[in-house]
């Protein structure tokens, strides 16, 4: 049997204590030896039965006295075997041994759980010499015990290269339950079961767990720690905690919020960062994610022109970085833009729609039906064309750019003319006779210069030749028309 000192006899119906029938004391236990103050010791039980051999190590000295009487075997006296006390209380325990005076330099060391206790511990050794023996009492005190002081303490003494070891003194520090695992906040799918775990330890054991959901007890009877609660599903946010009970009282875990995953809120603050003729860069502020990470977003683009067919273009993109460049748009057009994002539950509603416009672009096509002919009487080249389709002008025409290249006997020079937007004809002076003139025309908007038309060539003869037929933009397939007159 283990010797025990307990704080108080406190039976608790149907909660069996760890050491049934034993006493416990919160006062400093008085062990083996009378205390100077005359304070009465707590109830102690001898750890050995009559006639039972001592459990500690015993040294049998070889030295004999003058009368040649063998010395009795050396051993620590029996002491209290188990001390149970509450956290933050003080405790003092000791080892005692009587050593024949023939032995010098005897020291006692304290060990806890197999490791020597060195340094700043309150260990005091007192010597009480007598005629033949010296009583040595080693005391160990802890002023405010903590759970870490739990353990098995022993005394050791070295004599004649022999080690004498005391019986262990078990210190058990009891307190309120201490959580080793508490429920964690989670985001869960609506109406889907999930588990929460709660674990707490003593001493004293057992530790019993109650679960609390939104301030209502889930289990009306306690469950032994550790406890796993299977929550059968939630339809709305709930707060869970667990209560851990032991004979010392109860400890309540932190309350954790369990959120229900939902579709996200729509993005807000959709704004235009940059516009070009054919693209718009937008950004947005994501809405609340519905307790589930965003997966991707969808940008919806509608032509704002009331005459358009109302079709919606959809562009999918990743949820980050809340930025998207919408491409393949028409120039100088108005668009309505909305953004929606999704998580594992589904798509958000669309953000408030915003209006955005593309800028003017350079025309996307060249003027059509370019014709060139020589007006010899005025020594000019007349050029005519048709303006490009309005849809493909990509802006408001501000004019045309005419490139005319003159090539003769190994020399070549290019000249550029700007023409106002009103007409669809131009006249340029002949620069060189007996030369080929190559004409190309591009439409111009504020957005820039469009592509040039295919080249049209006309031969300008020397002075004195007669009538000239016009040259014109070739039919498809004629790569490089030359009109020789």
């Amino acid at each position: 049997a283990i010797t025990e000192a307990r704080e108080e006899a406190k039976p608790y119906p149907l909660f069996p204590g760890p050491f049934p029938g034993s006493l416990q004391t919160d006062h400093t236990p008085l062990l083996s030896l009378p205390h100077a103050s005359g304070y009465q010791p707590a109830l102690m039980f001898s750890p050995t039965q009559p006639g039972r051999p001592h459990t500690g190590n015993v040294a049998i000295p070889q030295v004999t006295s003058v009368e040649s009487k063998p010395l009795p075997p050396l051993a620590f006296k029996h002491t209290v075997g188990h001390i149970i006390l509450s956290e933050h209380k003080g405790v003092k325990f000791n080892c005692s041994i009587s050593v024949p005076n023939i032995y010098q330099d005897t020291t006692i060391s304290w060990w806890k759980d197999g490791k020597e206790l060195l340094g700043a511990h309150h260990a005091i050794t007192q010597f009480y010499p007598d005629d033949e023996v010296t009583a040595i009492i080693a005391s160990f005190s802890i002023t405010s015990v903590q759970r870490s002081d739990n353990g098995s303490y022993i005394c050791k003494m070295k004599i004649n290269n022999e080690e004498i070891v005391s019986d262990p003194i078990y210190i058990e520090v009891q307190g309120l339950p201490h959580f080793t695992k508490q429920p964690e906040s989670m985001n869960v799918t609506r109406n889907t079961a999930f588990n929460l775990t709660c674990q707490a330890v003593g001493p004293p054991e057992p530790v019993n767990i109650f679960w609390v959901q939104n301030s209502s007890r889930v289990n009306e009877q306690p469950e032994k720690s550790p406890s796993v609660l299977t929550v059968p599903g939630l339809t709305e946010m709930a707060v869970f905690s667990c209560e851990a009970h032991n004979d010392k009282g109860l400890t309540v875990s932190k309350g954790v919020q369990i959120n229900i995953k939902a579709i996200p809120s729509p993005p807000t603050e959709v704004s235009i960062r940059n516009s070009t003729a054919h693209s718009i860069l937008i950004s947005w502020v994501p809405g609340f994610d519905g307790y589930s990470p965003f997966r991707n977003c969808s940008i919806q683009v509608k032509e704002a022109d009331p005459l358009s067919n109302g079709s919606v273009m959809i562009f999918n993109t990743s949820a980050l970085p809340h930025l998207y460049q919408i491409k393949q748009l028409q120039a100088l057009a108005n668009y309505s833009i909305g953004v929606s994002c999704m998580n594992e539950i589904g798509w958000s509603a669309v953000s408030p729609w915003i209006l955005a416009s593309t800028t003017e672009g350079a025309p996307s096509v060249a003027p059509l039906n370019v014709t060139v002919f020589l007006n010899e009487s005025s020594d000019n080249v007349d050029i005519r064309w048709m303006k490009p389709p309005t849809k493909q002008q990509d802006g408001e025409l501000v004019g045309y750019r005419i490139s005319h290249v003159w090539q003769s006997a190994g020399i070549s020079k290019e000249l550029l003319e700007e023409v106002g937007q009103n007409g669809s004809r131009a006249r340029i002076s002949v620069q060189v006779h007996n030369a080929t003139c190559t004409v190309r025309i591009a439409a111009v908007t504020r957005g820039g210069v469009g592509p040039f038309s295919d080249p049209v060539k006309i031969f300008i003869p020397a002075h004195g030749w007669v009538d000239y037929a016009p040259s014109s933009t070739p039919a498809p397939g004629n790569a490089d028309p030359v009109l020789i007159i």
Partner: antibody
């Protein structure tokens, strides 16, 4: 398997007492509380309260405070319902039922009919 | 205490018909349980915590709801479903039951 077996029907005179038993088997008796539920003839179910089989502490619904006593004998895994000063309106079937998480009555006794008549 | 009101009190239904029983609480509750009771028998656990079928309950049964409004649905009624169904709330003491809905087969 888990079973709750209740004592047989009782015919009592007004003013008398009756003790209904509910013997549990197939599980650890002290792990789950025991509820008592009353069903008057042709009526619905009414929760009377429960007893903590771990501590022995009873809890009574407001309408069942006074003449109703829940008790236990854990050595035989049995819960008891005692009604004193019986009245005609106590005529009903009394059920015991285990108390699970979220007050789920997963297992029920077969019911005991108590008839109070002069 | 929370009062649970079931509707209808009584319903006569033909087999294969869809049946819906509602249970309305006088204030919000966390979960609703449902029990089935046949004449001269004890109630049987039927639907746990609003939507979880008890062991052995046919899949034609389902439960739903939250807050104050809860529903037990039978997708395609069968003859063996003739019984009285009771709802019971968890969340506020005392525990209370609905008055019951009796289903009869036409």
């Amino acid at each position: 398997q888990i079973q709750l077996v209740q004592s047989g029907s009782e015919l009592k005179k007004p003013g008398a007492s009756v003790k209904v038993s509910c013997k549990a088997s197939g599980y650890t008796f002290t792990n789950y509380g025991m509820n008592w539920v009353r069903q008057a003839p042709g009526q619905g179910l009414k929760w009377m309260g429960w007893i903590n089989t771990y501590t022995g502490e009873p809890t009574y619904a407001d309408d069942f405070k006074g003449r109703f006593v829940f008790s236990l004998d854990t050595s035989v895994s049995t819960a008891y319902l005692q009604i004193s000063s019986l009245k005609a309106e106590d005529t009903a079937v009394y059920f015991c039922a285990t108390y699970g998480h979220y007050a789920w009555f997963a297992y029920w006794g077969q019911g005991t009919l108590v008839t109070v008549s002069s | 205490e929370i009062v649970l009101t079931q509707s209808p009190d009584f319903q006569s239904v033909t087999p294969k018909e869809k049946v819906t029983i509602t249970c309305r609480a006088s204030s919000s509750v966390s979960y609703m349980h449902w029990y089935q009771q046949k004449p001269d028998q004890s109630p049987k656990p039927w639907i746990y915590a609003t939507s979880n079928l008890a062991s052995g309950v046919p899949s034609r049964f389902s439960g739903s709801g939250s807050g104050t409004d809860f529903t037990l649905t039978i997708n395609s009624l069968e003859a063996e479903d003739a019984a009285t169904y009771f709802c019971q709330q968890w969340g506020t003491k005392p525990l209370t039951f609905g008055q019951g809905t009796k289903l009869e087969i036409k």
